[in-house]
Interface confidence: medium
């Protein structure tokens, strides 16, 4: 709305950076094969480029990734009993971001 | 996959806690009439809970929100030329999160 | 503070019963897996049973299956251990504990132990 | 059944470095880990998780796991480190414990 600008700050923008947010490990990423398992943990951090740009032509992206295993809990289910195991996930943490030009394609004539 | 086991660090559960994440400024949080103009800037930081928690049954959830004005700048196009404007935009941030029981309807028999 | 008190240990003869209790306070007990554990005197440790955060998974080492039963009252905060048909051989120091998540893994918190005699 | 083998005893001089081993079938596929248990009192989480130490566990203590053998290392061990150490590894549907070693601190 257009009211109450007396107690409002201005808005700063998000820039282009790092930030933590959370990746859930799903199980397809374990064993596409085997619905019959659980995964723990469920969730862990990671970093990831966000934010915004100067120009509206251009977006945040990654300009440094990395790529990080980790072990994860596989709870499998036999005979209505768990058999706890181990499973590595690969994660992709962001290590550095830019403000990368979109080159939008151009219709083909 | 079950390989490369050693190189892996066990992963660490991300906490229900509270994050700094983006959050877009859409157009019609501003002005739902018109799609004649821009908003700056595009996108701001706001306190969000995150993370997983412990139980099958829980989620993470806020246990203290605030709301939190800002003012934006609205640039209309007038005639081609832009006219910049004021606009207050309430964001959300969350102040604590918890873990809630989620209560799964039961099927009506 | 944080804690798991336990009760119901003592003196019982061959064939006989014993119910094992163990009260958790300060923190959210029905979130918790949760396990007896025990301990022959002079031996190690011997997991004996768990329990899931609500009730529903159980199990038991072979040596006390069929005979013990593991419960617990989350209204109450507590947990128990039903022991039938005790042996000799279950004599030692038994001992309730905690897992952090409701799958199990480690016993992060323990109780101060109980003692169980079987003897004639 | 699963079976966990521990050394009956180790024995370390104050400030040296104690290993304490615990050998398994494939015993790297599983999370291990170690309890210290003192003379009267109960058991104590040290690592869990093959190497994660709890809050209030020196930073002495680590752990570490791979192929048949998890290890337990007490770097500059002290007096009250005396105490006997058990691994643990929750397997197939039972949590299992190794038969716990003693350790002692010399002098």
């Known amino acids: 709305s257009l009211g109450s600008l007396a107690a409002a700050e201005p808005a700063v923008i998000a820039e282009c950076k790092t930030r933590t947010e959370v990746f859930q490990i799903s199980r397809n990423l374990i064993d596409r094969t085997n619905a019959n398992f659980l995964v723990w943990p469920p969730c862990v951090e990671v970093q990831r480029c966000s934010g915004c740009c100067n120009n509206r032509n251009v977006q945040c992206r990654a300009s440094q990734v990395q790529m990080r295993p980790v072990q994860v809990r596989k709870i499998e289910i036999v005979r209505k009993k768990p058999v706890f195991k181990k499973a590595t996930v690969t994660l992709e943490d962001h290590l550095a971001c830019k403000c990368e030009t979109v080159v939008t394609p151009r219709p083909v004539t | 996959s079950l390989g490369s086991l050693a190189a892996a660090e066990p992963a660490v559960i991300a906490e229900c806690k509270t994050r700094t994440e983006v959050f877009q400024i859409s157009r019609n949080l501003i002005d739902r009439t018109n799609a004649n103009f821009l908003v700056w800037p595009p996108c701001v930081e706001v306190q969000r809970c995150s993370g997983c928690c412990n139980n099958r049954n829980v989620q993470c959830r806020a246990s203290q929100v605030q709301m939190r004005p800002v003012q934006v700048r609205k640039i209309e196009i007038v005639r081609k030329k832009p006219v910049f404007k004021k606009a207050t935009v309430t964001l959300e941030d969350h102040l604590a999160c918890k873990c809630e029981t989620v209560v799964t309807p039961r099927p009506v028999t | 503070e944080v804690q798991l008190l336990q009760s119901g240990g003592g003196l019982v003869k061959p064939g006989g019963s014993l119910r094992l209790s163990c009260a958790a306070s300060?923190?959210?007990?029905?979130?918790?897996?949760m396990s007896w554990v025990r301990q022959a005197p002079g031996k190690g440790l011997e997991w004996v049973s768990y329990?899931?955060?609500?009730?529903?998974?159980?199990y038991y080492a072979d040596s006390v299956k069929g005979r013990f039963t593991i419960s617990r009252d989350n209204s109450k905060n507590t947990l128990y251990l039903q022991m039938n048909s005790l042996r000799a051989e279950d004599t030692a120091v038994y001992y309730c504990?905690?897992?952090?998540?409701?799958?199990?893994?480690?016993?992060?918190?323990w109780g101060q132990g109980t003692l169980v005699t079987v003897s004639s | 059944s699963y079976e966990l083998t521990q050394p009956p005893s180790v024995s370390v001089s104050p400030g040296q470095t104690a290993s304490i081993t615990c050998s398994g079938d494939?015993?790297?596929?599983?999370?291990v880990h170690w309890y210290q248990q003192k003379p009267g009192q109960s058991p104590v989480l040290v690592i869990y998780?093959?190497?994660k130490r709890p809050s209030g566990i020196p930073e002495r203590f680590s752990g570490s796991n791979s192929g048949n053998t998890a290890t337990l290392t007490i770097s500059g061990t002290q007096a009250m480190d005396e105490a006997d150490y058990y691994c643990?590894?929750?397997?197939?549907?039972?949590?299992?414990f190794g038969g716990g070693t003693k350790l002692t601190v010399l002098g």
């Open positions: 998780d093959d190497s």
């Open positions: 329990i899931s955060d609500d009730g529903s998974l159980k």
């Open positions: 494939s015993l790297g596929s599983y999370f």
């Open positions: 504990a905690r897992h952090p998540y409701w799958y199990g893994g480690q016993l992060d918190l």
């Open positions: 300060g923190f959210t007990f029905s979130s918790y897996a």
């Open positions: 643990s590894a929750f397997t197939h549907n039972s949590d299992v």
